[in-house]
Interface confidence: low
């Protein structure tokens, strides 16, 4: 997260760290007792490592009573996701067992009504992604509030040049932005999961390259079919 601040500890109990060989790789969001939603491209970066999900964490390194690392039983990328595009960039991870729920571990309701968030709405994005262009990685969860940007502006030739589909949304990126390592994490508007940070190699913090988020409401049928 660029231009953000440290989050209040455990105030986002839905927040997950998708890890490979014990290292944070991507963000994720607990959407059901045994399922974490993240970004499909995160799996590509996993190579042959062991994928696990950390729940109940604020600090990645310090012992915390609520922290628990879960093995992944099943990884379900969206069937139309492809390495060369950010379309359908969603991944559902089934934990090896139901998460132990509590004040620091709790699923987040996700948006099922398929309509765009009003431009200008302030939404919260959080993650353990880099906090500087030099690539410094935080130990504790960071967050930032970002205004939603209308799709027409986001699709301008100077911005994302038509790449933003109806199934994506944008947020402003003027020095405050999600960045590398935040992919798969939640964009939360009014206490509801609206978007998932896409995992393209986009430049961060440049106002002409807004943050791109996959709209979960657009994938409600797929999410329901996997969680069924």
């Amino acid at each position: 997260i660029l231009g953000g601040r440290e989050a209040e500890a455990h105030a986002r109990p839905y927040m997950a760290s998708v890890q490979v060989n014990g290292e944070h790789l991507c963000g994720g969001v607990l959407v059901a007792e045994q399922w974490v939603l993240s970004a499909a491209h995160c799996l590509e970066d996993a190579a042959d490592g062991k994928v696990q999900v950390l729940l109940g964490a604020h600090s990645l390194s310090q012992p915390e009573p609520s922290k628990r690392l879960y093995d992944v039983l099943r990884a379900v990328p969206h069937p139309d996701s492809r390495p060369d595009t950010i379309d359908h960039d969603l991944l559902l991870l089934q934990l090896s067992e139901k998460a132990t729920l509590g004040p620091a571990v709790r699923p987040l309701p996700w948006q099922r009504v398929d309509r765009d968030v009003e431009p200008g709405t302030l939404c919260d994005v959080a993650g353990w992604g880099i906090v500087s262009h030099a690539g410094r990685r935080p130990d504790r969860l960071q967050h930032v509030l970002l205004p939603v940007l209308d799709r027409a502006t986001c699709n301008r030739r100077t911005h994302h040049d038509g790449a933003i589909t109806q199934r994506m949304m944008c947020a402003e990126s003027n020095r405050r932005d999600s960045c590398k390592g935040d992919s798969g994490g939640p964009l939360v508007c009014g206490g509801v999961l609206e978007g998932v940070v896409t995992s393209g190699s986009r430049v961060c913090g440049n106002r002409k390259k807004p943050g791109i988020y996959t709209r979960v409401a657009s994938y409600a049928a797929w999410i329901d079919s996997v969680l069924a």
Partner: antibody, heavy 120, light 107 residues
Amino acid sequence: EVKLVESGGGLVQPGGSLKLSCATSGFTFSDYGMAWVRQAPGKGPEWVAFISNLAYSFYYVDIVMGRFTISRENAKNTLYLEMSSLRSEDTAMYYCARVGLYGNFFMDYWGQGTSVTVSS
Amino acid sequence: DIQMNQSPSSLSASLGDTITITCHASQNINVWLSWYQQKPGNIPELLIYKASNLHTGVPSRFSGNRSGTSFTLTISSLQPEDIGTYFCQQGQSYPLTFGAGTKLELR
């Protein structure tokens, strides 16, 4: 057309080792989890081992844990099962099977099998 | 481990009959149940996955249903080529486990 062809079976003495191979074609191997399933004569199938598409997850049935190792070589579209400390109860037809896309755990295509007999 | 109790163990039916095979899981497996057919001397072949989804090329006379932890495979209008042994398999958690099988014969 999806094709799975097992090889490497044979007669082996108790305590011996074998390495089974499964050559695949007709699908993008690296997209799919793979499994080995065995079937003793006159019995039902028994799932033995699973490996995820990127080889980050491995699962084994308890009775082969520590004796069998599943692996894959995505560049060669090939699945392997290394078996050691073999016992008479490991005698079976061993099938390589493709696991439903993205880890939905059913076996949608099976090879013709390779026979393993453990006997002195 | 999840036990899969399959019944009956054998079944005799006539051509054109509708038959039902049942599988009961020892714990909740959601929809993660598959059915396989194994013809004599042949390999197992997938019929149904995720409780009720027909695999490619499987005739529509085969159908699957779920009621809680009980699952049924129904074959309507039995054909000669349907003779063989049918197995259920749970895919909820490892180890993956199969039912003991139902041998279907022509009366």
